[in-house]
Interface confidence: medium
């Protein structure tokens, strides 16, 4: 399928240009969504190009500035949160990033009301975290590693915790680890629906090892960054969950929530936390061998005032055939009778879909069924489910929202997206309004980008909020590269794959031939979204083909395809790009002479042992910020996929995986290793032992590193990266600059 | 665009009273503190009086207090001044001014065009 | 009250010239200061907030420093269209109040 054609008529081709590095390094041809920000079922907010705050009434049409761009820049805010009563609104300013999702700020709050700023008992900075209440204007935000809590914003804060410590004891906000690999968040603390009860996480990280390296800076001497951190097998946070009434937070404080007993017994995480009433909330937990997850529902007793999570509200989830969950454990929506739910796990076949669960998982009513999977609910109302699949027309790198009528009997299932504007758009996400009244579609592509406006009862579209149109102008005279999505049988395994071609592409011809791979488990490449970047410019310019392959691993396939990684990682994700690359080979239109890989992080592992898998396919490749050892990554993540580093478990395997052990298979090939040296995610570590090893090998090698750069190369990196990243290939390639 | 226009200015005479009006448009009036700045002929800038956007607070210059009152109906999105036991030294033009609140400042960003009260027997 | 002292009470200048006011205070604004311009039978317009800001649509050529008691307003290539009166304001304390201001003639 052809899914971007190119505009090449003779008449054109004087016009029209190829891309450029520089277009790609200066986002020129980036792309806008809009997504609403909800405050009531017909209302939302929006920041205008100028930057005031401005609310939107649907039904009646009208708009006016909550906002002046003048507030916000008075205090240099770069966010702001209204508070649900809309008396005030906080704006956030000097953002400091940490990791992934943490940040630290300067937060001011403004009265609405009065037109000022709240002045007396202000703010601390910088700030970790901080959130209004779902209903009224209360604030909890956390300081220090400690929560604090004030009923309005001009009040003295109550001080919930006083235990917090840097780097030992983390109170309402993740550490390390549970931030990147387990919540995806930078909060660990949940208001209650009606803001009665404030819920929060303890991370305990006194006994965690250490991972330290050096941040040059530019003073005489480094600083030691210092980030507790387990790596596979290592000791492991230790988590608590809190729950304190808002209302009177001094009367009997925090109490805590008890851990099932069959998680207890032995090494655990806590895996999310969702509220379903003021007075009832459902704690996920798994083992640490992720294998067994169980959700708790538990209940306020108001004559102890305590929170009792009773056996029968216990409902497990156990795969048996890898890992519990795809990337995590999928969380419940409930439904308005407050105690059953829909909840996304694999059916007897092997494929995610949805299940309603009323009293137990095993008298679960499987709600959608097929070779497809669901992907995510959005939302529940009272006679509608809203969700997202990959079923249409069997493509599973397509998004398509579904609506599925729960109120009415049988319940019909309608596809809101499919026939929307079936060229452009069959990668979709939503965004709902408050009872599910209006929604947001957000169109990725594969055509330019679009986001609509719909209405929650018909789906009728009402507006456009953005289209892109200066995109849609910039790129008429650009000569896109082709992109097709298709896939290949091999031994009863389906690898689909997307590959780019150049815009005069000729079957003819031999082509270079580049492979992108991350194929990390539960990942997917091969999406139908619109992307103008770096390889895009490869093909649009340089003639390259490049082809991304989702190999065995990879989501939303089935549990056979993504399992068939578990324990042993670093295998077939490997042998199924090289299957691909040789059917790529047997298609006639590539010079098997000129075939490279690369990837970053998971895809640097992968790429780096393709290139030490002795086949002689690949003539070079490059390695951005990669694993090299299991032992070396997140205990979370890790030992997910691979158990434990210990003898009676997967040591064998850990041992055998590294890229390290093969370092003498790099001889024949041309290999850049890349990595920033402040990667607090994938260790400098990695590469360095790499180096070290083919070093002890004698096999020359290049290699890059960024001083104080994380695991994502940004800023000026980003630019120095792919200018020497483009140099290696083209020299690889034989291709002139 | 934003506008403020003011009316209700004239001659009056030592004692008498006076009601001025300034209209708005062009921006949410409700958000916003609002104030009078006078300049009598010849003279200089002087601050009057100002009133935050619900209302609830009012700050007055110490030689009109207890002589004159803002207030504002937001439902209107108008300002008012009104101005008892008038003096001579109140003659001057006045200005009717959208106040900007920021965090470290406060300013009178937008200003009609003045209205003219002349106080004289 | 917090009183406001600007000077010069007035200057001659000429176009492209390089032009300073100063304004300083009785006490301590922080930086609680406003500059505007007034011509004649005009209202006044806000110039610069905060000290040193800005305001939207004002020239580049208009800059502002200072913070505590001394404040200074530059004009760094004088303008046709830039002779008038120039005031000063503290907001930092009621009763507001402004410099007594600066004419700026050509010369």
């Known amino acids: 399928i052809v899914l971007r054609p190119s505009r090449v008529h003779n008449s054109e081709e004087n016009t029209m240009r190829a891309l450029t590095l520089k277009d790609i390094l200066n986002g020129t041809f980036s792309y806008k969504t809009f997504f609403p920000n909800w405050i009531s079922g017909q209302e939302y907010l929006h920041q205008s190009a100028d930057n005031n705050i401005v609310l939107y009434n649907i039904e009646t049409g009208q708009s006016y500035t909550i906002l002046s761009n003048r507030t916000m820049k008075s205090v240099n805010a770069s966010n702001y949160g209204l508070s649900p009563d809309r008396q005030f609104v906080y704006l956030e300013s000097d953002y400091s990033k940490l990791w992934r999702y943490s940040y630290t700020a300067t937060y001011y709050i403004y009265d609405l009301s009065n037109g000022e700023f709240v002045r007396g008992n202000e703010l601390p900075r910088p700030i970790q975290y901080l959130c209004w209440s779902p209903v009224g204007s209360k604030l909890a935000y956390v300081y220090q590693n400690n929560i604090y809590l004030k009923q309005r914003p001009g009040d003295p804060p109550f001080q919930i915790t006083f235990n917090g410590r840097e780097n030992k004891i983390f109170n309402g906000i993740p550490d390390w680890v549970y931030e990147e690999e387990m919540l995806a968040t930078k909060y660990a603390l949940w208001w209650s629906p009606n803001g009665k009860f404030l819920a929060y996480a303890e991370f305990n990280d006194t006994d965690i090892p250490v991972i330290a390296y050096s941040y040059y800076g530019d003073e005489q001497y480094p600083r030691t960054i210092n980030i507790p951190y387990p790596k596979a097998g290592a000791k492991n946070p230790v988590v608590r969950i809190f729950i304190i009434d808002t209302t009177y937070p001094a009367y009997v404080g925090p109490q805590e929530v008890p851990v099932p007993a069959m998680i207890a017994s032995s090494d655990y995480y806590f895996s999310w936390l969702t509220w379903v009433t003021d007075e009832r909330v459902c704690l996920q937990w798994l083992k640490r061998v992720q294998n067994v997850s169980v959700l708790s529902i538990c209940d306020f007793r108001e004559d102890w005032q305590t929170w009792d999570c009773p056996k029968t509200q216990e409902h497990i989830e156990e795969s048996r055939t890898g890992w519990a969950g795809g990337f995590f454990v999928s969380t419940p929506v409930f439904s308005y009778d407050a105690i059953s739910y829909y909840k996304i796990f694999s059916d007897k076949d092997g494929y995610k879909h949805i299940h309603y669960i009323k009293d137990t998982v095993e008298n679960a009513i499987q709600i959608t069924s097929g070779k497809w999977e669901a992907i995510n609910i959005f939302r529940v109302t009272q006679d509608s489910l809203f969700y997202s699949s990959n079923e249409f027309e069997e493509y599973p790198g397509r998004r398509n929202i579904y609506r599925i009528s729960i109120g009415s009997y049988p319940p019909s299932k309608k596809c809101v997206t499919c026939h929307l504007r079936k060229e452009r758009c069959q990668y979709y996400t939503a965004s709902f309004s408050d009872y599910a009244k209006y929604y947001a579609l957000v169109c990725y592509g594969p055509g330019i980008p679009i986001s609509t406006l719909h209405d929650g009862r018909t789906d009728q579209e009402i507006k456009i909020l953005e289209e892109n149109k200066e995109l849609e102008n910039a790129l008429k005279n650009i000569q896109l590269p082709k992109e097709e999505i298709k896939k290949l049988e091999v031994d009863e395994i389906t690898l689909w794959y997307k590959m780019i071609l150049p815009p005069q592409f000729d079957r003819s011809k031999k082509y270079p031939l580049l492979i992108q791979v991350y194929g990390g488990p539960c990942s997917q490449s091969v999406r139908s979204v619109f992307a103008v970047n770096w390889i895009s410019y490869l093909a649009s310019k340089e003639g390259m083909v490049i082809a991304l392959v989702d190999g065995r691993g990879t989501a939303f396939q089935g549990d056979k395809l993504l399992y068939a990684v578990y324990r042993k990682l670093g295998v077939y994700e490997v042998e199924d790009q090289i299957t691909a690359v040789r059917k790529f080979i047997e298609m006639g239109f590539i010079d098997e002479k000129r075939i490279a890989i690369w990837g970053w992080s998971y895809g640097g592992y992968v790429s780096s042992l393709a290139l030490a898998s002795g086949t002689g396919l690949f003539k070079c490749g490059i390695a951005v910020a990669p694993v090299s050892s299991w032992e070396y990554y997140a205990s979370v993540y890790t030992e997910r996929f691979m158990g434990l580093p210990t003898k009676d478990d997967n040591l064998e395997h850990y041992k055998n995986s590294t890229v390290m052990a093969r370092a003498e298979y790099f001889r024949n090939v041309d290999y850049l290793l890349i990595h920033g040296t402040a990667d607090d995610n994938v260790h400098f570590q990695n590469s360095a032992q790499i180096a070290k090893a083919l070093v002890n090998a004698q096999v020359d090698f290049q290699a890059m590193w960024y001083s104080d750069q994380n695991h994502g190369l940004s800023g000026l990196s980003t630019n120095h990266l792919y200018t020497h990243m483009t140099h290696f290939l083209k020299q690889c390639f034989s291709l002139s600059d | 665009e934003v506008q403020l226009l003011e009316s209700g200015g004239g001659l009056v005479q030592p004692g008498g009273s006076l009601r001025l009006s300034c209209a708005a448009s062009?921006?949410?009036?409700?958000?916003?503190?609002m104030t009078w700045v006078r300049q009598a002929p010849g003279k200089g800038l002087e601050w009057v009086s100002s009133?935050?956007?619900?209302?609830?607070?009012?700050y007055y210059a110490d030689s009109v207090k207890g002589r004159f009152t803002i207030s504002r109906d937001n439902s209107k999105n108008t300002l008012y001044l009104q101005m008892n036991s008038l003096r001579a030294e109140d003659t001057a033009v006045y200005y009717c001014?959208?106040?900007?609140?920021?965090?470290?400042?406060?300013?009178?960003?937008?200003w009609g065009q003045g209205t003219l009260v002349t106080v004289s027997s | 009250d917090i009183q406001m002292t600007q000077s010069p009470s007035s200057l001659s200048a000429s176009v492209g010239d390089r032009v300073t006011i100063t304004c300083r205070a009785s006490?301590?604004?922080?930086?609680?200061l406003n500059w505007y311009q007034q011509k004649p039978g005009k209202a006044p317009k806000l110039l610069i907030y905060?000290?040193?800001s800005l305001q939207s649509g004002v020239p580049s050529r208009f800059s502002g420093s200072g913070s505590g008691t001394d404040f200074t307003l530059t004009i760094s290539s004088l303008q046709p269209e830039d002779f008038a009166t120039y005031y000063c304001?503290?907001?930092?304390?009621?009763?507001?109040?402004f410099g007594q201001g600066t004419k700026l003639e050509i010369k």
């Open positions: 001014a959208k106040t900007f609140s920021g965090y470290a400042h406060y300013d009178f960003d937008y």
């Open positions: 062009g921006f949410t009036f409700s958000r916003y503190a």
């Open positions: 009133i935050s956007a619900s209302g609830g607070s009012t």
């Open positions: 006490q301590s604004i922080s930086s609680y």
């Open positions: 905060a000290a040193s």
């Open positions: 304001q503290q907001s930092y304390s009621t009763p507001y109040t």
